[in-house]
């Protein structure tokens, strides 16, 4: 597995913040782990990034991710509730110039180097529907959300309100 | 135009329930988390729990045996009771929402006028 | 529980003056830090969010500055309408708790 090595918490300097003509609001790098406790890992195979769900050997480094947060703004028509709104918006990035992606076709979560400005497909919206516990929601693919199936990341069709609180979908984020 | 409105009885008797609701208007419940939170004349500000754009409630651990959040969406309404009510629990009682849509993160941007309950016999 | 703790618990200070209130988290919150001002019989109204963004409104004399444990909300020139009193607020956690509130008032 691997990290982000010699970044400093809250460091703006791995990833240039003018993505799609936007600056994140802020950024810092934290682990990520399922709702049950699991480790989301990173590990390099054949040339190309896989990533995992799995419990940690106990000691053992979590991964980290810098997480940047966008702030998206809705005007009110397209709103449909009168008002202009925003959402934040993330993108995570495990290791310098790799992005996490939503793959919507193979409904798969998946890691691609990445040229700015990064893609619709890099961005996810950030819910907090659950104490402590974060969604996130594909900005390509509203109702989708990324989520764990096999001990993978993958994405999961969330059809209603009530099932926003799938622990399959809901991660917790620590910076310890 | 954003709206928050708290109303319920003013004066609850000790050990009674204190019902109150937060009518909203100008966005949807269904995007904005919705929030209560209370601040005893002359004491700061304390959250007492959420009824999240999802439909999910998280409470403040410190009174969720006595705290119930509701909602009806079909009147843009969210409720809170508090039973078995002391002097401790008289307050302005507040509901604000969300500055972000679907998140919590960005604080409360819009508030109510609040509300004084008043515990006492 | 995250503790936020508020230093001063109040201070006076003069029109024009620039004042400073620090907000302190009993763990890390990130940049999940909001900040408002009450009046009087007033209910709260929020000033920063994010620990450094702006709120709709909100007079560019007010900043906000910090991220992990120690923030800072400074008035660049203190008018006459923002003698209030002053709550940090953290976001990263359930229960969203407030630091207990800095009162500033005129000299």
């Known amino acids: 597995a691997f990290g982000i090595s010699g970044v400093q918490k809250y460091t703006r300097a791995l990833h240039d913040s003018s993505i799609t003509g936007i600056s994140p609001i802020t950024e810092y790098l934290a682990s990520l782990s399922t709702y049950n406790d699991q480790s989301i890992t990173f590990a390099l195979e054949d040339e190309s990034y896989e990533i995992y769900v799995e419990d940690l050997k106990k000691d053992e480094k979590k991964d980290k991710v810098l997480l940047s947060y966008y702030e998206s703004q809705h005007p009110s028509n397209e709103s449909g509730d009168g008002v202009d709104g925003k959402m934040l918006m993330v993108t995570l990035s495990p290791t310098k110039d790799f992005w996490l992606h939503a793959n919507n076709k193979e409904h798969s979560v998946e890691l691609h180097k990445c040229e700015k400005p990064l893609p619709d497909q890099a961005f996810f919206v950030l819910h907090n529907m659950h104490s402590n516990c974060v969604s996130f929601e594909c900005k390509t693919d509203p109702g989708v959300f990324i989520g764990v199936k096999d001990n993978h990341l993958a994405l999961i069709k969330v059809d209603s309100s009530e099932n926003l609180c799938t622990e399959n979908i809901l991660f917790k984020l620590s910076e310890t | 135009q954003v709206q928050l409105q708290e109303s319920g009885p003013g004066l609850v008797k000790p050990s009674e329930t204190l019902s109150l609701t937060c009518t909203v208007s100008?966005?949807?419940?269904?995007?904005?988390?919705v929030h209560w939170i209370r601040q005893p004349p002359g004491k700061g500000l304390e959250w007492l729990g959420v009824l999240r754009a999802g439909g999910t409630i998280s409470y403040n651990s410190a009174l969720m045996s006595r705290l119930t959040i509701s909602e009806d969406i079909s009147k843009s309404q969210v409720s809170l009771k508090l039973s078995s009510v002391t002097a401790a629990d008289t307050a302005v009682y507040y509901c604000?929402?969300?500055?972000?849509?679907?998140?919590?993160?960005?604080?409360?941007?819009?508030w109510g006028q609040g509300t004084l309950v008043t515990v006492s016999s | 529980d995250i503790q936020m703790t508020q230093s001063p618990s109040s201070l006076s200070a003069s029109v024009g003056d620039r004042v400073t209130i620090t907000c302190l988290a009993s763990?890390?919150?990130?940049?999940?830090l909001a900040w408002y001002q009450q009046k009087p019989g007033k209910s709260p109204k929020l000033l920063i969010y994010a620990a450094t963004r702006l709120a709709d409104g909100v007079p560019s004399r007010f900043s906000g500055s910090g991220s992990g444990t120690d923030f800072t909300l400074t008035i660049s020139s203190l008018q006459p309408e923002d003698f209030a009193t002053y709550y940090c607020?953290?976001?990263?956690?359930?229960?969203?708790?407030f630091g207990q509130g800095t009162k500033v008032e005129i000299k």
């Open positions: 604000a929402r969300d500055h972000y849509y679907y998140s919590s993160f960005g604080g409360f941007a819009s």
């Open positions: 100008g966005f949807s419940l269904s995007k904005y988390g």
């Open positions: 607020q953290q976001l990263y956690n359930t229960p969203y708790t």
């Open positions: 763990q890390t919150i990130a940049t999940w």
